[in-house]
């Protein structure tokens, strides 16, 4: 299942907690993995009575879960923090809530932003 | 079932360091959070840190920073914690933590069975 | 930081009582709050998260309420097992807090 070689990706970068742990607020992240092993996006969020907040997005380490997934969606029905992860560059831009028991799908569209490199 | 395995008691003279390893096993390491807890003897929980074993970026209490050092190898699915310059307040049970949610922090799910860090002269 | 604060200290109680911790935080955390036990010599265990959700294979006498500044663990009917030292924790926002703990001692 592995590619042979780590596949450079790049991914939509964004931390909620950026000031703690020192990094770009967001931008664009470079992937880096090892050998073998596949790179993905994600992006993750919570819902805090009713407000959709942002926590983070970036590189994501090889993960069957994500396998040719094009798209970043979300299917667990209502988890403490949502998480959907992609294949392919800045698959992350924008995220999806679609849960597998049914219910409304939920776009979620990224506000314009000059992005900065991170590596 | 998940299993978090800690290393061994330690007993260290003020001003050295310890290196506390967590084995990880019954779920995708790469996937959760990773935090560290502590208790003094007689004390409650004090929340160290955090790593994320995907690409082991960091986040330190403002007490530890500085002296604390959250490191992890994903070829043995294991996580470290290393603290330096120690003195007696840091005698406590040292406990990984793993977390709950995928792609940031909430609760703590499973535990590591906690390791004893003594710091006498 | 957020301040989280437990009350009481410690609680004396009996098998088959109806008790109630409560935990106040400094300011809102949501309902970003799980609810702890433990035990010495044995490692934490998560009974309650999300202030209200029951974690897996912990006993429906357990139960969390609140949201914003104020929670309360309840657990309707004391059995044996129970008595413990009680932890809430918010994870609203860095650092991760908890209260200072409920001691939970046989009356």
């Known amino acids: 299942s592995g590619r042979g070689e780590a596949e450079t990706r790049e991914c939509i970068y964004y931390n909620a907690n950026w000031e703690l742990e020192r990094t770009n607020q967001s931008g664009l992240e470079r992937c880096e993995g090892e050998q073998d092993k596949r790179l993905h996006c994600y992006a993750s969020w919570r819902n805090s009575s009713g407000t959709i907040e942002l926590v983070k997005k970036g590189c994501w380490l090889d993960d069957f879960n994500c396998y040719d997934r094009q798209e970043c969606v979300a299917t667990e029905e209502n988890p403490q923090v949502y998480f959907c992860c992609c294949e392919g560059n800045f698959c992350n831009e924008r995220f999806t809530h679609l849960p597998e028991a049914g219910g409304p799908e939920v776009t979620y569209e990224p506000p314009p932003t000059a992005p900065t490199l991170l590596t | 079932q998940v299993q978090l395995v800690q290393s061994g008691a330690e007993v260290k003279k003020p001003g050295a360091s310890v290196k506390v390893s967590c084995k990880a096993s019954g779920y995708t390491f790469t996937s959760y959070y990773m935090h560290w807890v502590r208790q003094a003897p007689g004390q409650g929980l004090e929340w160290m840190g955090i790593i994320n074993p995907s690409g082991g970026s960091t986040s330190y209490a403002q007490k530890f920073q500085g002296r604390v050092t959250m490191t992890r190898d994903t070829s043995t699915s294991t996580v470290y914690m290393e603290l330096s310059s120690l003195r007696s307040e840091d005698t406590a049970v040292y406990y990984c933590a793993k977390d709950q949610s995928r792609g940031w922090y909430s609760n703590f799910d499973s535990w590591g069975q906690g390791t004893l860090v003594t710091v006498s002269s | 930081d957020i301040q989280m604060t437990q009350s009481p200290s410690t609680l004396s109680a009996s098998v088959g009582d109806r008790v109630t911790i409560t935990c106040r935080a400094s300011?809102?955390?949501s309902n970003w709050l799980a609810w702890y036990q433990l035990k010495p010599g044995k490692a934490p265990k998560l009974?309650?998260?999300?202030?209200?959700s029951l974690e897996s294979g912990v006993p429906s006498r357990f139960s969390g309420t609140g949201s914003e500044t104020e929670f309360t663990l309840t657990i309707s009917s004391l059995q044996p097992d129970d008595f413990a030292t009680y932890y809430c924790q918010q994870y609203h926002s860095y650092p991760i807090t908890f209260g200072q703990g409920t001691r939970l001692e046989i009356k």
């Open positions: 009974l309650i998260y999300k202030a209200s």
């Open positions: 300011q809102t955390v």
